[in-house]
Interface confidence: low
Amino acid sequence: EVEKTACPSGKKAREIDESLIFYKKWELEACVDAALLATQMDRVNAIPFTYEQLDVLKHKLDELYPQGYPESVIQHLGYLFLKMSPEDIRKWNVTSLETLKALLEVNKGHEMSPQVATLIDRFVKGRGQLDKDTLDTLTAFYPGYLCSLSPEELSSVPPSSIWAVRPQDLDTCDPRQLDVLYPKARLAFQNMNGSEYFVKIQSFLGGAPTEDLKALSQQNVSMDLATFMKLRTDAVLPLTVAEVQKLLGPHVEGLKAEERHRPVRDWILRQRQDDLDTLGLGLQG
């Protein structure tokens, strides 16, 4: 908390400019009018304030808007957003996509912070729905955001959003989510050639049906065991030994190490022993 002191003569700020970086914290508190700050928030980011000085500016805005900042101020917060707590953000009513983008840009390159999670929650609730533009924006900044959505919410995700997704962003998705995402990925990547297509679709294959796995087995994709182990059991069971051998290529030897785990275990039990023996891995059905 900054002590209330009178502003020294001649130091009253008439506008938010670079001269303020030389003000001590108490001088900022005393000499910068909160209403002036609110109307010139867009200038703050161009000025190299210290974190301590930013704390003072935040304090002034908090006093001016105890019920929460208006969107006109929020949109221009810039780096001051990093000073906000989830509690601060819960008071906001953010409805403009431009505001959301501006604040996500500030946090870009970092993990989704509690502040950002709260901001997104406030924005989506304010809009009343997860529309295409919102999803496009969120997945552009946080592709991992997809896995935090329910299958019902995911059904409205446009295939174009899938382009920004990286394999690690699907790590937290469960099979029900992948069931919804896989057809979208298939559509998004449909014009790519075989090997490039497999590189892109690989992360989504936990939602692939049997017929698509059969088709992939004809394309020399050499699926690794980690991917195979994430496939739907019901999709793997109808595959023949020959199809699995083609699907895995040189990785087929890895089946031995996974023979007690699903889906390999269940698949082995469905095969004729004669067919399993052709693999030469000692798998017992």
Epitope: D136, P159, S160, W163
Partner: nanobody, 127 residues
Framework: QVHLVESGGGSVQAGGSLRLSCAAS????????MGWFRQGPGEEREGLAQ???????KYADSVKGRFTISKDNAKNILYLQMNSLKPEDTGLYIC?????????????????????RGQGTQVTVSS
């Protein structure tokens, strides 16, 4: 497949401006992202700018503040507004529709994963 055709190149004095256009047609025009890269005399490729269909733009340090990428989604035309041109900006400017929107990959090699690309439009900046 996506078909890309660039236009707007030409010769200009240092400090001048040019606006390049890239008309896109085909069945995947509205998805993913699009970008511009420059091919120099020695065939070296330099990723310059990229824009996602949600209009988030990225720029290489060498052109930041001078070049602006934009896209008219209704007409499927990609633009590159180039101001304060320098002699080192000379090259063949090529429009591409990367199959992967990774900016870092685009900077390393604009043709990673062999995306659709145009034939290019030549820009010559003289001092």
């Amino acid at each position: 497949q996506v078909h890309l055709v660039e236009s707007g190149g030409g010769s200009v004095q240092a400090g001048g401006s040019l606006r390049l256009s890239c008309a896109a047609s085909g069945d995947r025009v509205s998805t993913g992202c699009m970008g511009w890269f420059r091919q120099g005399p020695g065939e070296e490729r330099e990723g310059l700018a990229q824009i996602h269909n949600y209009n988030i733009a990225k720029y290489a340090d060498s052109v930041k503040g001078r070049f602006t990428i934009s896209k008219d989604n209704a007409k499927n035309i990609l633009y590159l507004q180039m101001n304060s041109l320098k002699p080192e900006d000379t090259g063949l400017y090529i429009c591409t529709a990367p199959v992967d929107c990774s900016w870092s990959m685009f900077l390393q090699d604009p043709l990673a994963l062999s995306p659709p690309r145009g034939q290019g439009t030549q820009v010559t900046v003289s001092s």
